[in-house]
Amino acid sequence: VPRWRQQWSGPGTTKRFPETVLARCVKYTEIHPEMRHVDCQSVWDAFKGAFISKHPCNITEEDYQPLMKLGTQTVPCNKILLWSRIKDLAHQFTQVQRDMFTLEDTLLGYLADDLTWCGEFNTSKINYQSCPDWRKDCSNNPVSVFWKTVSRRFAEAACDVVHVMLNGSRSKIFDKNSTFGSVEVHNLQPEKVQTLEAWVIHGGREDSRDLCQDPTIKELESIISKRNIQFSCKNIYRPDKFLQCVKNPEDSSCTSEI
C-alpha cells in the first residue's frame, strides 16, 4: 500500500542535499583555517536532527540550536555586509573586498545557500518531492526558520558601521517583509552598532535619481533612528564600475562618483 505523502506548494529538497552540505562543509573548513576544528560529519548530524522526522510546518529556532553551536564562528563585527534582494552583487563584492563578510561567507550561510530541504513527520526520510512554501503553506518551515535563526545571530553580532546593499530596481527598495527588514534590522544592537549605511544599487545606466530619497528608504531611516542607530545612505549609480573600483581603487576613474 503506497504511503500517503503530504504535497506542499514549494519545490522539494535539493537533490543530493546531504552530500552537498557535507561537501560544502569540507570545502569551507579546508579554505578557512579558523574552522579546521569543525567535524563536518557532526555538523551534518546536527543539521539532519533539526528537520528530519519533524513536521515541516512546526520547526522552531530551538531545533537549530545544536547546529548553531557547532557552527559558531567569529567574524569581524565591524566588517559585516547585509543585503536585500541583491545577493549576487553582495557576494561579488565580498569576493573582492575579502575583509568584509555576508552571511553566506560564514560556514552556516555557505552550507545552506540556495538549497531547499524538509522532512516528514515521524519518518526518517528527506522529502525530495515538495516542501512548504513560506506564503502558500507555512512560515515555520525548515528553510525559513534556518535563515531567520542565522540572520538574527549574524545581525546581533554586528558592531560599529554596518553596511547593507539594497536593490534600487525594485518597487520596494526597502521591504519590511524581507529577511533584512523583518529580522536583521530589528536585531542590530544599538549599544554596539553606531551606524547603518545603506548602499542603494541602481539598475539602469541612465538612472541618475537620488534613490536615497525613496519613501521606503525614509521608512528604513525612521525604523533605524527609533532604535538609536544612525543612518546614512549612498547611491551606487554604476555597480559595474563600483566593483571595478573596489578591485582597483587607484584607477583614475574611481575618484568620480560611482
Partner: antibody, heavy 120, light 107 residues
Framework: QVQLVQSGAEVKKPGSSVKVSCKAS????????FSWVRQAPGQGLEWMGR????????NSAQKFQGRVTITADKSTSTAYMELSSLRSEDTAVYYC?????????????WGQGTLVTVSS | DIQMTQSPSSLSASVGDRVTITCRAS??????LAWYQQKPEKAPKSLIY???SLQSGVPSRFSGSGSGTDFTLTISSLQPEDFATYYC?????????FGQGTKVEIK
Amino acid sequence: QVQLVQSGAEVKKPGSSVKVSCKASGGTFSSYAFSWVRQAPGQGLEWMGRVIPFLGTANSAQKFQGRVTITADKSTSTAYMELSSLRSEDTAVYYCARDDIAALGPFDYWGQGTLVTVSS
Amino acid sequence: DIQMTQSPSSLSASVGDRVTITCRASQGISSWLAWYQQKPEKAPKSLIYAASSLQSGVPSRFSGSGSGTDFTLTISSLQPEDFATYYCQQYNSYPRTFGQGTKVEIK
C-alpha cells in the same frame, strides 16, 4: 547483493600497527559511508570511526584519535582502518559496517569481522 | 558522549514468550536509535532503525518503540532462532555509541 569482505586475522606485537581492509561489492561504494566497530572477547560493540569515500574525510571517537586512521580507496571500493601503538587491550574482532552518507539509517551491512590479536 | 544503558543485561525465556528489552540514552536522541541482533561468532544484524522502523527482511514479531531517551525492543513470540545478544545504538551524534547488550537465553 551487497557484501563487505574483510582481510584475514592478524597477530601483532605490542607497539606495532595493524591495517584491516574491507572490500565492498554489490552497491555504489561512493554512495555510502563505512564505520569500524570493534568487539573485545566477551564484550560489547565499540564504534571507532567512519569514513565517507566520496569526500575522503573521516572522523573517529576521541578514545582512538591519534592512533586510528580510517581511509577509503574509491578505485578498489575498499575501506581501511589502521590502528597504531597496539596494546594487549586492542585484541578484538574488528568489523566494518555500512550506512548511508546522510546517516538516516542503521549499519545495514557488516563485514565478517577480522580478529586482531596483540601479544608479545 | 551519549551513554546507552540497556536492561536487563541478560534474561531467560521460553519459546513463545513475549520479551521486552529497554534502552535508555543519557540525553535526548529523538528517534535516532537502531537495534541489532548478534549470534556467537557472527557479525551483528540490523533489526530496527529510527526507533520503530523494521529493517527489510526482519520478521514482524520484532518491534521497536520510544523516542527521546527511552526505547523498547519487543519480540512478541520468541522463536528458537531469536536466542542471541541484542544491542541498541544511537546515531544522533558522534561518537556513535552502543548499549552494553542484552543476552536472551533459553530457560
